[in-house]
Amino acid sequence: GSERTCCPVNWVEHERSCYWFSRSGKAWADADNYCRLEDAHLVVVTSWEEQKFVQHHIGPVNTWMGLHDQNGPWKWVDGTDYETGFKNWRPEQPDDWYGHGLGGGEDCAHFTDDGRWNDDVCQRPYRWVCETELDKASQEPPLL
């Protein structure tokens, strides 16, 4: 067929997207590259429903998403508009905190232990979630 009808092995299908949940940690840029090599991107949260789905799978663990402001304004990695889109920041976040002593501020967004978002130092080795739209996934049958 011209489109894939199910997700690759070890990926979870939800609302026409496939999700992969890491069980180890990487810096944000390395997590971003991981998803890209898998023909995916770091998860882009576009609704409260998607937020709850991801939150259910990651549990109370700091986890990178595909949102950053390393070049100035906040941007989603797939081009989804940040200003008009879904947001779920913790109170008083993002704050670009410089007090961590690691140099610079905080340019990468992650899910916190309660699922709400925080900005943090991009080098921290957090878990991550990859996402790919089902009709953009590889055009082959699922791996056996």
Epitope: K26, R36, E38, P141
Partner: antibody
């Protein structure tokens, strides 16, 4: 049985170009990221480039960025490495390799093809 | 770039010996490490992935351990087919980098 067959190597002058090919069989080619690795004579292994299964994302070592281009034709089950502006230090055996999903190790390798850059 | 340093650079051993090769990363790579065996004129062969997972078809005398920055490849009882060069590779961050190799020679 998974097989990778490297070809396209040869003798080329500095500044010249060459295109390497890697013909794959025995697995669903488009489902796997692929990579090129090289080994200069008597030296260790050096990662050169990688490409995602659908070909939309590519990655390069700094030593080849802007000169080499990795690509793939999934309809032909073939991986390519276009090498331009070749230098003497690019002389090496070039191997293509299949990448294990999720783990990112190279589980199958081609037999290698020798590229010699010399005047 | 992450530097991978192997030690020793070569080791002389006899059949039946236990051989240990170490690999150190210049920064933490969790368990994103692979080990390969290479014989002269041949392509490398994957032995271990994810630091400790034995690749299918590889004899159980090979094992890997470690996490973070320090890793070990152990051959529990060296066999004639094991005389070769072994190298580690980190796949945590691009550019992926290899160790310089450890040559296991016959004593």
């Amino acid at each position: 049985e998974v097989q990778l067959l490297d070809s396209g190597g040869g003798l080329v002058q500095p500044g010249g170009s060459l295109r390497l090919s890697c013909a794959a069989s025995g697995f669903t080619f488009s489902s796997y990221a692929m990579s090129w690795v090289r080994q200069a004579p008597g030296k260790g292994l050096e990662w050169v480039s990688a490409i995602s299964g659908r070909g939309g994302n590519t990655f390069y070592a700094e030593s080849v960025r802007g000169r080499f281009t990795i690509s793939r034709d999934n309809s032909k089950n073939t991986l390519y490495l276009q090498m331009n502006s070749l230098r003497a230090e690019d002389t090496a055996v070039y191997y293509c390799a299949k990448i294990i999903r999720e783990q990112w190790a190279f589980d199958y390798w081609g037999q290698g093809t020798l590229v010699t850059v010399s005047s | 770039d992450i530097q991978m340093t192997q030690s020793p650079s070569s080791v002389s051993a006899s059949v039946g010996d236990r051989v240990t090769i170490t690999c150190r990363a210049s920064q933490g790579i969790s368990n994103w490490l692979a080990w390969y065996q290479q014989k002269p004129g041949k392509a490398p062969k994957l032995l271990i992935f994810a630091a400790s997972n034995l690749q299918s078809g590889v004899p159980s005398r090979f094992s890997g351990s470690g996490s973070g920055t320090d890793f070990t490849l152990t051959i529990s009882s060296l066999q004639p087919a094991d005389f070769a060069t072994y190298c580690c590779q980190q796949v945590n961050s691009f550019p992926w980098t290899f160790g310089q190799g450890t040559k296991v020679e016959i004593k």
